[in-house]
């Protein structure tokens, strides 16, 4: 049976999933899919990691933990009622039928208050990693507005500047999300 998680329309949903790497850096592939875990793989894949990196993701789906340490929890940005349903987290452990499978049921409730487009509530208690400057997902900014047409060099530079800046700490403490992909 699935474990149930809840979020409101317009919020970010957090679907926890973890595994213990056999040794540091000895990562295993992980896939996230919409729909219950099938016998093999994930159906309707929304995000995938390999032994080194996040190698596939779709819009609004990202990892805000450190997947290199075994935190492969999924965040879905700005959810709508259509995001309701079962999600599969599959830890693809080598060997026949060794995979760990987690079916998580996401229930989306209508928003109590219409969220302002450029503001986000403080979800730091709910989300393990609200600020990350590592490449765990697509480029997105929620308090500063979007980052149009920024090339990889600029992103890398911005990431380095943010990492040690007071701005980064202020944003983290306020619960804002800055992700540099």
């Amino acid at each position: 049976s699935e474990v149930e998680y809840r979020a409101e329309v317009g919020q970010n949903a957090y679907l926890p999933c973890f595994y213990t790497p056999a040794a540091p850096g000895n990562l295993v592939p992980v896939c996230w899919g919409k729909g219950a875990c099938p016998v093999f793989e994930c159906g309707n894949v929304v995000l995938r990691t390999d032994e080194r990196d996040v190698n596939y993701w779709t819009s609004r789906y990202w990892l805000n933990g450190d997947f290199r340490k075994g935190d492969v929890s999924l965040t879905i940005e700005n959810v709508t009622l259509a995001d309701s349903g079962i999600y599969c987290c599959r830890i693809q452990i080598p060997g026949i039928m060794n995979d760990e499978k987690f079916n998580l049921k996401l229930v989306i409730k209508p928003a109590k208050v219409t969220p302002a487009p450029t503001r986000q509530r403080d979800f730091t208690a709910a989300f393990p990693r609200m600020l990350t400057t590592r490449g765990h997902g697509p480029a997105e900014t929620q308090t500063l507005g979007s980052l149009p047409d920024i090339n990889l060099t600029q992103i890398s530079t911005l990431a380095n500047e943010l990492r040690d800046s007071r701005l980064a700490n202020d944003l983290r403490d306020s619960g804002a999300t800055i992700r540099i992909g």
Partner: antibody
Amino acid sequence: EVQLQQSGAELVKPGASVKLSCTASGFNIKDYYMHWVKQRTEQGLEWIGRIDPEDGETKYVPKFQGKATITADTSSNTAFLHLTSLTSEDTAVYYCARSNPYYFDYWGQGTTLTVSS
Amino acid sequence: DIQMNQSPSSLSASLGDTVTITCHASQTINVWLSWYQQKPGNIPKLLIYKASNLHTGVPSRFSGSGSGTGFTLTISSLQPEDIATYYCQQGQNYPYTFGGGTKLEIK
């Protein structure tokens, strides 16, 4: 062999600050989250916060924000807990622990902090 | 924050008994729950992770079960060395939280 060696007992005066250390051997702290846990005499375990030594990113229990600062020095494979404006309420044993990734598989021996005038 | 309510807070049992300690989470934590044993004057020691997985070197008389919000630690055939305080801990959401502990004594 994995070990977490913590600094020795501290006796400090109210209002002072203290910095506790936790030096790891047998693994690289960059590969794990490093945590600090408080335990007052005859009381339960209370999570203070953690650091990701790889990039310095921290998480704290709100009540310890401003009281505790967790840092790490990857060159010496050491995590630190800096406590400020000490009061008798801070008298406790402080443990460091590593997580793998969501449970604590190794713990330091604990550092006893006594705040007294 | 997720509250972890552990019961009973203290427990007295005879050698050879089967002992059960429960932990209830204020919201679902799936299987992201661990159990620790702390003997008097000692450091906490991991017993069980992911609700039911026995940590390396832990005797098989310890077992864990549960998912969602309700969890159980069972000690079968209680031994003298099991005198300790036992804690549950959720690792799903920050801030991590511990149960209040269960002090186990021998009758």
